[in-house]
Amino acid sequence: EVEKTACPSGKKAREIDESLIFYKKWELEACVDAALLATQMDRVNAIPFTYEQLDVLKHKLDELYPQGYPESVIQHLGYLFLKMSPEDIRKWNVTSLETLKALLEVNKGHEMSPQVATLIDRFVKGRGQLDKDTLDTLTAFYPGYLCSLSPEELSSVPPSSIWAVRPQDLDTCDPRQLDVLYPKARLAFQNMNGSEYFVKIQSFLGGAPTEDLKALSQQNVSMDLATFMKLRTDAVLPLTVAEVQKLLGPHVEGLKAEERHRPVRDWILRQRQDDLDTLGLGLQG
């Protein structure tokens, strides 16, 4: 806390400018009007304030807006955002995607902080669902964002938003998350033709049921082994040797290299040896 002291004569700030970097903490507290700061927040980022000085500026805003900052101030917080606690952010009502982008830009290149996580949570809850533009923005800043959500949170993602998802956005998703996302992707891409559909749906197939894999096996899709290895065990086990051969196409030879790994191992174990022998790969059931 900075003590309340009178502003020295001639030091009263008329605007937020570089002269303020020479002010001591107590002078900033005494001489900068909080309302002036709020209206000129966009200038703060252009001025090389010390962390201690930024603490004072935050304190002034906290006093002016004890119930939480208005969005007009939040949008221009810039590096002052890094001084905010999750508790501060929970008081905010952020509705503009531009505001969200501006604050994410401040944290760019770093892992998602508790502050950013809270900000995103507030924003998404305010919107009611993860729309395409929001998802586009979040995955651009944090490719792993989608996979950081619980299956329950993912259920609020509308199928239309799935178009914004890139394969790398799903890299760290676990099977339970893909179980939620796959039906949405299937719905989103349902009007595409066979080969185009497979390209889009491929990243989501870790949530696909057996019947969908059987259907894909009839379409000459040539699934690669990396995708096959991510399929649900319960979806793979009922597939016949012939179906797996059709599903993988020329990639079927890759089964040999993965025979000790799941789910390939689980599938091999449950096939008739005579059927496995038709592949000519030396797989032992």
């Epitope: 676990d174 099977p175 339970r176 290895m229 991510k230 065990t233 319960d234 086990l237 000790r260 790994h261 799941r262 191992r265 689980d266 174990l269 449950r270 032992q284 059931g285």
Partner: antibody, heavy 119, light 107 residues
């Protein structure tokens, strides 16, 4: 519900063969989804997986024990068995049989049987 | 073989504490990671399978996360009956391996 029960001698002499049987009750050893494992735990130490068998007779063993281990299954008796040859004092442990459900893991265990290797 | 490294090997905690145990695989094991609880003189008990799925009958204070090589078991609010040894186990590779265990003791 499925239960497992280990049986066999509690004392084996060095260089001899350790033999244990696990009896499955309340379920079938011929289950499509399950393999049947043996796991051991030396006194005061961690868990070591020995190997598993599928009802078809397919087996998979821990590479470090493979040369000494044989696991077999008797579907008519609803049992599976472990044989560990050329035992030494280092094989003294609590031996567990367990069901390995393909979707979950070792979800059902026997209560364990202590086997001591000593002359 | 895939090596599983657990940390810490032991920890002291109080009832009500949040406890986190980590498990690292020497290579990627996707989500094929299970967690077990073992009490003295008893067989292990499955808590979490497939890295994050709660086994039927296990209290919701237990949760698991992670994929690839790094995994975490969290007990959100430690209860008296939770003092035990915890093991992770990979089932991705045909040669199953367990972590060395983490003993959770009363502070």
């Amino acid at each position: 519900q499925v239960q497992l029960q280990e049986s066999g001698p509690g004392l084996v002499k060095p260089s001899e063969t350790l033999s244990l049987t696990c009896t499955v009750s309340g379920g079938s050893v011929s289950s499509f989804t399950d393999t049947w494992s043996w796991i051991r735990q030396p006194p005061g130490k961690g868990l070591e997986w020995i190997g598993y068998i599928y009802y078809s007779g397919s087996t998979n063993y821990n590479p470090s024990l493979k040369s000494r281990v044989t696991i077999s299954v008797d579907t008519s008796k609803n049992q599976f068995s472990l044989k560990l040859s050329s035992v030494t004092a280092a094989d003294t442990a609590v031996y567990y049989c367990a069901r390995d459900n393909v979707f979950t893991g070792f979800d059902i265990w026997g209560q364990g049987t202590m086997v001591t290797v000593s002359s | 073989d895939i090596q599983m490294t657990q940390s810490p090997s032991s920890l002291s905690a109080s009832v009500g504490d949040r406890v986190t145990i980590t498990c690292r695989a020497s290579q990627s094991i996707s989500s094929y990671l299970n967690w077990y609880q073992q009490k003295p003189g008893k067989a292990p008990k499955l808590l979490i399978y497939a890295a994050s799925s709660l086994q039927s009958g296990v209290p919701s204070r237990f949760s698991g996360s992670g994929s690839g090589t790094d995994f975490t078991l969290t007990i959100s609010s430690l209860q008296p009956e939770d003092f035990a040894t915890y093991y992770c186990q990979q089932s991705y590779d045909a040669s199953y391996t367990f972590g060395g265990g983490t003993k959770v003791e009363i502070k």
